[in-house]
Amino acid sequence: LVITPPGPEFVLNISSTFVLTCSSSAPVMWEQMSQVPWQEAAMNQDGTFSSVLTLTNVTGGDTGEYFCVYNNSLGPELSERKRIYIFVPDPTMGFLPMDSEDLFIFVTDVTETTIPCRVTDPQLEVTLHEKKVDIPLHVPYDHQRGFIGTFEDKTYICKTTIGDREVDSDTYYVYSLQVSSINVSVNAVQTVVRQGESITIRCIVMGNDVVNFQWTYPRMKSGRLVEPVTDYLFGVPSRIGSILHIPTAELSDSGTYTCNVSVSVNDHGDEKAINVTVIENGYVRLLETLEDVQIAELHRSRTLQVVFEAYPTPSVLWFKDNRTLGDSSAGELVLSTRNVSETRYVSELTLVRVKVSEAGYYTMRAFHADDQVQLSFKLQVNVPVRVLELSESHPANGEQILRCRGRGMPQPNVTWSTCRDLKRCPRKLSPTPLGNSSKEESQLETNVTFWEEDQEYEVVSTLRLRHVDQPLSVRCMLQNSMGRDSQEVTVVPHSLPFKV
């Protein structure tokens, strides 16, 4: 871009006519304060482009900056612009007139700012004063911009002398604003809604006084705009919120809602997004399944948990053997359903100090008007094994018969063992397992019965010893996943006159 005359600053005589030409290899135009002043564009014989800006019969009001810019958007390499500044000293005009909004200067932190009182004559001396105090402040003055410095929250006025009269500017008001690093949070009252229900999304900014909110949302694509409401939420720290509300959601309102926040007084900004799903009907669906058989241990507490997803909030019922369960006053049974996220639920059945009678078939059912789901399982109460009796008998044929009876849940296993050295048995010498032996020294028979009312197994094991030629310590041991139990008996040969 080439400007002729080259500038960068001109001081023009009042009432004169002044012509500025900007030339380039691409089309150009003149701008003044984002306005396009009167100008003529031309394409020259040599292929260059020019725009001629004519300032006719100039006055002090023509004082200001002018830019020559490319007048097409051919990319960033053409975003260059050239600036010139024109003064038209005008004794009838003191300070250049200002738009009323430019008299209010918002300052962030301790950043340098400008009080933009400008005069038409670069030779004039200009001073800055606090309005209440008439002492000039020592702040540097730029005739093209104004006073540049760090200012307190006060009221200021500029002064100059034209000829023999003192001229005051308008009053400038400086306000300090709280502008911290911008931190935006977006939340929705619900991110899942049924069609016809409302969508409400809040965008909140903390610790900033002056911010702009800009929303993008699915409805914008079809040109249906929603007017957000912005609120100042008092408190410490201060919060400003913008609320987007759609009273009657449609399926097409599903999608991403983005809140873009920019600070008016600087270039800081942030944006956050949230997804909203509009569904035709409500739903309930299980997120986890349970094994068909659940185990509880006798006299221990057991919590059974079902995780599911639903919208809207469903009702939840638990059943045992087809009978509805409720919290028991004795505190033996606790039912609870809690909302762990917007659409996620955990329903728990807690059995306190489980009893055998609590074994059975359980069902959880979650339902609402649109959908329902249920989950069933069998609760097995495990009971530690007990050896209830270990007895012996001596039939006439010379055999010794040992009978061991015990109970437990799950089904206990029976192990018989023997030890011949009574003094060292069983601590110092491992017992020898007994069972059906090929030598027919012993014969073992075990019967198992499940007692429905007690929900446990009974095991009766009979051990037949063909002949016992010396004293034996015989042990019957029952074992299941809950533990083990055993009893011992000493068996002596028939020929011995005593029994230990």
Epitope: T4, P5, F18, V19, E40, T48, V52, T54, T56
Partner: nanobody, 125 residues
Framework: EVQLVESGGGLVQAGGSLRLSCTPS????????MAWFRQAPGNEREFVAA??????????SMKGRLTISRDNVRDNGQKTVFLQMNNLQLQDTATYYC????????????????WGRGTQVTVSS
């Protein structure tokens, strides 16, 4: 280098008319303002008229008796500027100069970088 060649001057009776022409020797791509100035012996150079784009300007001394115009671009890119002077008076006697500028004050001779050698206009009674 661009040269400006003036023509059309001469002796004319008071109340008569003249049409002055100014022709650049080569194309004047960088030139924005074409103007006429005059200088009588012992006087300063005085602005007469100027033309740029679709705009024209006239000095106070001959206002109402002048028309400045420009012909269409010829094949070689040269533009001839014309000054039509009517109802000439004795005090219009002077050397008339053609000048070209790329921008600046329209009325000020200091804004013009290129000057012709001038053409003499003499108004007799």
């Amino acid at each position: 280098e661009v040269q400006l060649v003036e023509s059309g001057g001469g002796l004319v009776q008071a109340g008569g008319s003249l049409r002055l022409s100014c022709t650049p020797s080569i194309t004047t791509a960088g030139t924005t303002i074409m103007a006429w100035f005059r200088q009588a012996p012992g006087n300063e150079r005085e602005f007469v008229a100027a033309i740029w784009g679709s705009k024209t300007a006239y000095g106070d001394s001959m206002k109402g008796r002048l028309t400045i115009s420009r012909d269409n671009v010829r094949d070689n890119g040269q533009k001839t500027v014309f000054l039509q002077m009517n109802n000439l008076q004795l005090q219009d006697t002077a050397t008339y100069y053609c000048a070209a500028s790329s921008g600046g004050y329209v009325h000020s001779s200091t804004s013009y970088e290129i000057w012709g050698r001038g053409t003499q206009v003499t108004v007799s009674s």
